[in-house]
């Protein structure tokens, strides 16, 4: 069960913004389902961060499936969530303010804030560090600005543009975009274990991206996918390195985990990085 004892490495990444999803299902992999019909559908690809075509078999599958490119973009891309709020005196909040708190699938336990539509207030919650939805803010102020009704009858949209209710003028504001964990490892580390097509029962390991651990499974001896390793160490080496946390606009910290729980101080916020 020994893992490589690696240092935290600062790397830079100015190309990809944090992966922020309006809906958790946008992170599901394309699932053609068990039927064999041919239907052109679209899914959101978390690696390319774009809506792409895939062939759907006509039954089952999952929610990351849309009849048109436009519908996919509307549900899963950030641009469509960041609309300027209506210019009436009683302005509407962005749609994502009404999404329920979503800790996501990772285990980072980061303090974040979300707008609770029941209490009509921004409240604290524990965020796992990846995926989730856009009702997720680094600060209470940011959450209030965007989702709570302001005292002067205005709200701030997610680009940080204040809409003045009196004259409908747009005033730039500086609001921070929430920073999230990202997965920068090989894409197959996020695929499910696949036994394959043959009849053997070989002991193999696969990376379970939901629990963040390498787990054993029985491999049939042929077929399957690349999330298939002969040892736990090999699995960890290939897949555990992938979780990266952004610490500033240009910088990322690669959280290569050690076996003991360790405290990492990042951007004034203490979090626990747990062992995989």
């Amino acid at each position: 069960d020994s893992e490589e004892d690696e240092e935290h490495t600062i790397i830079t990444d100015t190309e990809l913004p944090p992966l922020k999803l309006m809906h958790s299902f946008c992170a599901f992999k394309a699932d053609d389902g068990p039927c064999k019909a041919i239907m052109k559908r679209f899914f959101f690809n978390i690696f390319t961060r774009q809506c792409e075509e895939f062939i759907y078999g006509g039954c089952e599958g999952n929610q990351n499936r849309f009849e048109s490119l436009e519908e996919c973009k509307k549900m899963c891309t950030r641009d469509n969530a960041n609309r300027i709020i209506k210019t009436t005196l009683q302005q509407e909040k962005p749609d994502f303010c009404f999404l329920e708190e979503d800790p996501g699938i990772c285990r980072g336990y980061i303090t974040r804030y979300f707008y609770n539509n029941q209490t009509k207030q921004c409240e604290r919650f524990k965020y796992g560090g990846c995926l989730g939805n856009m009702n997720n803010f680094e600060t209470l102020e940011e959450c209030k600005n965007i989702c709570e009704d302001g005292p002067n009858g205005f709200q701030v949209d997610n680009y940080g543009t204040q809409l003045n209710a009196v004259n409908n003028s747009l005033t730039p504001q500086s609001t921070k975009v929430p920073s999230l964990f990202e997965f920068h490892g090989p894409s197959w580390c996020l695929t499910p274990a696949d036994r394959g097509l043959c009849r053997a029962n070989e002991n193999r390991f696969y990376y379970n991206s939901v629990i963040g651990k390498c787990r054993p499974f029985k491999y049939s001896g042929c077929g399957g996918n690349e999330n298939n390793f002969t040892s736990k160490q090999e699995c960890l080496r290939a897949c555990k390195k992938g979780f990266i946390q952004r610490i500033s606009k240009g910088g990322l910290i690669k959280t290569k985990r050690k076996r003991k729980k360790q405290r990492v101080k990042i951007a004034y916020e203490e979090i626990f990085v747990k062992n995989m």
Epitope: C35, K36, A37, I38, M39, G58, C59
Partner: antibody
Framework: DVQLQESGPGLVKPSQSLSLTCTVS?????????WNWIRQFPGNKLEWMGY???????SYNPSLKSRISITRDTSKNQFFLQLNSVTTEDTATYYC????????WGQGTLVTVSA | QIVLSQSPALLSASPGEKVTMTCRAS?????MHWYQQKPGSSPKPWIY???NLASGVPARFSGSGSGTSYSLTITRVEAEDAATYYC?????????FGSGTKLEIK
């Protein structure tokens, strides 16, 4: 509304080729779905023969693979069935259908194989 | 290939009765699909992916099942339901049909 219409000769001689056309109106065959040929024998038994997908890929019933070809003409929004070396056993009503189990079928055309 | 066996071959029912017809597959399939065919007409998609009613199908029809055993049920049969019903699997090439259940209304 999507409509499919089969056309072709109603009588074919044994050992010749059977050729049928399915003309689709109200929907582009390059937009989506698989476009199927299905036949129904005189005793009412149904057999899926094959399809051509919106992208042009084909899939055939293995029992017919050596004799069947499904092609298309996208400019006319038509797809075609060619069945070679026919015998009297190929006498049937031939249907074209969009994505067999949830789409419209044509009204069918009876093809008799006889000398 | 997967063979689909339908039973009964002939089903006779009076209006208002509940009827069930079954379709058994020689190997497990992910879903079953059903068609209704009336004399002189082409088959119409009736129930797809085991339990989903096709457009225009009355709510008295339902489908269920899994693995190798599937069924189509009509809660209160009406005269217009007289037809032959075929099951079809779309899980394994070749995509096969059952031999049909003919429903007669007394």
């Amino acid at each position: 509304d999507v409509q499919l219409q089969e056309s072709g000769p109603g009588l074919v001689k044994p050992s010749q080729s059977l050729s049928l056309t399915c003309t689709v109106s109200g929907y582009s065959i390059t937009s989506d779905y698989a476009w199927n040929w299905i036949r129904q024998f005189p005793g009412n038994k149904l057999e899926w023969m094959g399809y051509i997908s919106y992208s042009g890929s084909t899939s055939y019933n293995p029992s017919l693979k050596s004799r069947i070809s499904i092609t298309r003409d996208t400019s006319k929004n038509q797809f075609f069935l060619q069945l070679n070396s026919v015998t009297t056993e190929d006498t049937a009503t031939y249907y074209c259908a969009r994505w067999a189990y949830d789409g419209p079928w044509g009204q069918g055309t009876l093809v008799t194989v006889s000398a | 290939q997967i063979v689909l066996s339908q039973s009964p071959a002939l089903l006779s029912a009076s209006p208002g009765e509940k009827v069930t017809m079954t379709c058994r597959a020689s190997s497990s399939v992910s879903h079953m699909h059903w068609y209704q065919q009336k004399p002189g007409s082409s088959p119409k998609p009736w129930i797809y992916a085991t339990s989903n009613l096709a457009s225009g199908v009355p709510a008295r029809f339902s489908g269920s099942g899994s693995g190798t055993s599937y069924s189509l049920t009509i809660t209160r049969v009406e005269a217009e339901d007289a037809a032959t019903y075929y099951c079809q699997q779309w899980s394994s090439n070749p995509f096969t049909f059952g031999s049909g259940t003919k429903l007669e209304i007394k």
